[in-house]
Interface confidence: low
């Protein structure tokens, strides 16, 4: 039998007919053993249904009376077989059995889908003793059924080492469709087909699916769940959802946005994080990614000097971490910097250009044509040189540093001299005779001391020698300084 539980259904009477033997007419149990506190349910199903052969387990008692007549087989009485009801409704169903009084300590347990129901379920067992038999009613109630209550319920009773099992009572909880798969937001290429999936289940089945695009139904005829919607392509963003219908009503999925991939917006807020003589560290805030992940970025650098040839240097880098150190720049120079980033669709426009300057650096080259000669008459060494090229000074020249090392048998002595920026010659006193003097010169800016020139050596003889020939830095290509004595 299938019974559909409806809101207006009246509860069945607990005992539609008397049990064997004489029970009190008001059917008040003499003993009631609740397993857990119960509630008054909305529905209750009668423990007996006449006229159907029994299919549950039967126990044949071995004990006989004085007359040796065998006792009748023990079995649960028939009950409702299938209960259909809506979610959140209450339900109560029963198992009943009459047990001869010779059996003591009989207990009934409830099982669902093969597992015993323990703990705080609303199960109550009532005992109605008579002269020969005790009628036992086991009631099970659920105050507000959920889908998880769906299943097959049975009663079990252990008696004489035998297990008696009732017919199953199938509970079917029906409700609005329940989504097991909803459409998901996607970012798609313009005019490219894509699929959306929607799946919902009952009971009751079947569940029919309607697709909705921007609040308009896509399919006039519903499709059975699950449904796959193939969208041939979009030219602008759209919102899709699906409606799941069954006999209980309608459930609507979350609306999902399908975005059209586009080129990214240009980066914003390009800023200078640090500046040195030959590098600039920049950062930027990426623009909107156009619904497609950034792949990489390009930093464009051009000299801001109006007299420059306008060529653009391009540095490619990964999209993260929105930070890049631009190297190989000139010192004390002005640059315009822009950033562009790309995704799978293409390159963004360039960010607004920003101006940046490199700082003053130490010179990158040494003074040129260093020449050293001995002025014996005044006991001095004269040193001459040429300024490094202006572009390689990397800042405003503030002077020169001269290193001269004096070496003779067993001693070595290094001295440093500072010379103002305007000079291109210097004179140092002879420190030791009969010794070699090694001279090196470096240019100095506020950014620091540049590299020293290659060493130039001159021999300082003992008093009385004459030597007017200078020593000088080698011509390009020679491996060692030339020593002329």
């Amino acid at each position: 039998a299938i019974t559909e539980a409806r809101e207006e259904a009246k509860p069945y009477p607990l005992f539609p007919g008397p049990f064997p033997g004489s029970l009190q007419t008001d059917h008040t149990p003499l003993l009631s053993l609740p397993h857990a506190s119960g509630y008054q349910p909305a529905l209750m199903f009668s423990p007996t249904q006449p006229g159907r052969p029994h299919t549950g387990n039967v126990a044949i008692p071995q004990v006989t009376s004085v007359e040796s007549k065998p006792l009748p087989p023990l079995a649960f009485k028939h009950t409702v077989g299938h209960i259909i009801l809506s979610e959140h409704k209450g339900v109560k169903f029963n198992c009943s059995i009459s047990v001869p009084n010779i059996y003591q300590d009989t207990t009934i347990s409830w099982w669902k889908d093969g597992k015993e129901l323990l703990g705080a379920h609303h199960a109550i067992t009532q005992f109605y003793p008579d002269d020969e038999v005790t009628a036992i009613i086991a009631s099970f109630s659920i105050t507000s059924v959920q889908r998880s209550d769906n299943g097959s319920y049975i009663c079990k009773m252990k008696i004489n080492n035998e297990e008696i099992v009732s017919d199953p009572i199938y509970i079917e909880v029906q409700g609005l469709p329940h989504f097991t798969k909803q459409p998901e937001s996607m970012n798609v290429t313009r005019n490219t087909a894509f699929n959306l999936t929607c799946q919902a289940v009952g009971p009751p089945e079947p569940v029919n699916i309607f697709w909705v695009q921007n609040s308009s139904r896509v399919n006039e005829q519903p499709e059975k769940s699950p449904s796959v919607l193939t969208v041939p392509g979009l030219t602008e963003m759209a919102v899709f959802s699906c409606e799941a219908h069954n006999d209980k009503g309608l459930t609507v999925s979350k609306g999902v946005q399908i975005n059209i991939k586009a080129i990214p917006s240009p980066p914003t807020e390009v800023s200078i994080r640090n500046s040195t003589a030959h590098s600039i560290l920049i950062s930027w805030v990426p623009g909107f990614d156009g619904y497609s992940p950034f792949r990489n970025c390009s930093i464009q650098v051009k000299e801001a000097d109006p007299l420059s040839n306008g060529s653009v240097m391009i540095f490619n880098t990964s999209a993260l971490p929105h930070l890049y150190q631009i190297k190989q720049l000139q010192a004390l120079a002005n640059y315009s910097i822009g950033v562009s980033c790309m995704n799978e669709i293409g390159w963004s426009a360039v960010s607004p250009w920003i101006l940046a300057s490199t700082t003053e650096g130490a010179p990158s080259v040494a003074p040129l044509n260093v020449t050293v000669f001995l002025n014996e008459s005044s006991d001095n060494v004269d040193i001459r040189w040429m300024k490094p090229p202006t572009k390689q000074q990397d800042g405003e020249l503030v002077g020169y540093r001269i290193s001269h090392v004096w070496q003779s048998a067993g001693i070595s002595k290094e001295l440093l001299e500072e010379v103002g920026q305007n000079g291109s010659r210097a004179r140092i006193s002879v420190q030791v005779h009969n010794a070699t003097c090694t001279v090196r010169i470096a240019a100095v800016t506020r950014g620091g001391v540049g590299p020293f020139s290659d060493p130039v050596k001159i021999f300082i003889p003992a008093h009385g020698w004459v030597d007017y020939a200078p020593s000088s830095t080698p011509a390009p290509g020679n491996a060692d300084p030339v020593l002329i004595i």
Partner: antibody, heavy 120, light 108 residues
Framework: QVQLVQSGAEVKKPGASVKVSCKAS????????INWVRQAPGQGLEWMGW????????KYNEKFKGRVTMTTDTSTSTAYMELRSLRSDDTAVYYC?????????????WGQGTTVTVSS | EIVLTQSPDFQSVTPKEKVTITCSAS???????FHWYQQKPDQSPKLLIK???NLASGVPSRFSGSGSGTDYTLTINSLEAEDAATYYC?????????FGQGTKLEIK
């Protein structure tokens, strides 16, 4: 009929938190988003975010990220909005509003509003 | 974020007059995503027009809406005293959802 009933007015000190509730009735609570919108005294409307009660999915306005948490209790059809680290400029009327489900995206029913005053 | 700018901020009008409020968006919005609300003093906002031109349930027919792209208009034909309120436009095109700054309508 659809109704959204909000909790009563609150007075808080700067740095404290406030939790406003919004009880829905008259429709299936899990089918529609609950949005939170605030209105400072004499000012316009500012969207704070939404929550989808069916699965707790939230979308917050970046301006409030890290300070706001939206939750729901489907058993009582109630939505909650908690705002932390309150400042005086959080003084406003906070509204819950039902968001039409398909993201087109409008607010078809509003709560009566909860006044939150932040003052030392 | 999409910025909505309403015009005018304030308008004082006599009953039976026709009133036009405009709302300009900082980027193009499909008309499906554009809505109007009415907020009377000390009340919650109320949905007035959805999807540019569809009247919400219970809204009198003297209200109408139109527009496309970036420019949208709310029109009240033959203004009545009960229409004194602040009117807000709103876009549902992208998060964050945004409102116009509001237009306050006063009845002379």
């Amino acid at each position: 009929q659809v109704q959204l009933v909000q909790s009563g007015a609150e007075v808080k000190k700067p740095g404290a938190s406030v939790k406003v509730s919004c009880k829905a009735s008259g429709y299936t609570f899990t089918t529609y988003d609950i949005n939170w919108v605030r209105q400072a005294p004499g000012q316009g409307l500012e969207w704070m975010g939404w929550i989808y009660p069916r699965d707790g999915y939230t979308k917050y306005n970046e301006k409030f990220k890290g300070r706001v948490t939206m939750t729901t209790d489907t058993s009582t059809s109630t939505a909650y909005m908690e705002l932390r680290s309150l400042r005086s400029d959080d003084t406003a009327v906070y509204y819950c509003a039902r968001g039409y489900y398909d993201n087109l995206y409008y607010f078809d029913y509003w709560g009566q509003g909860t006044t939150v005053t932040v003052s030392s | 974020e999409i910025v909505l700018t309403q015009s005018p901020d304030f308008q004082s009008v006599t009953p039976k007059e026709k009133v036009t409020i405009t709302c300009s968006a900082s980027s193009i919005i499909s008309s499906n995503y554009f809505h109007w609300y009415q907020q009377k003093p000390d009340q919650s906002p109320k949905l007035l027009i959805k999807r540019t031109s569809n009247l919400a349930s219970g809204v009198p027919s003297r209200f109408s809406g139109s527009g496309s792209g970036t420019d949208y208009t709310l029109t009240i034909n033959s203004l009545e005293a009960e229409d004194a309120a602040t009117y807000y436009c709103q876009q549902g095109r992208s998060v964050p959802l945004t409102f116009g700054q509001g237009t306050k309508l006063e009845i002379k």
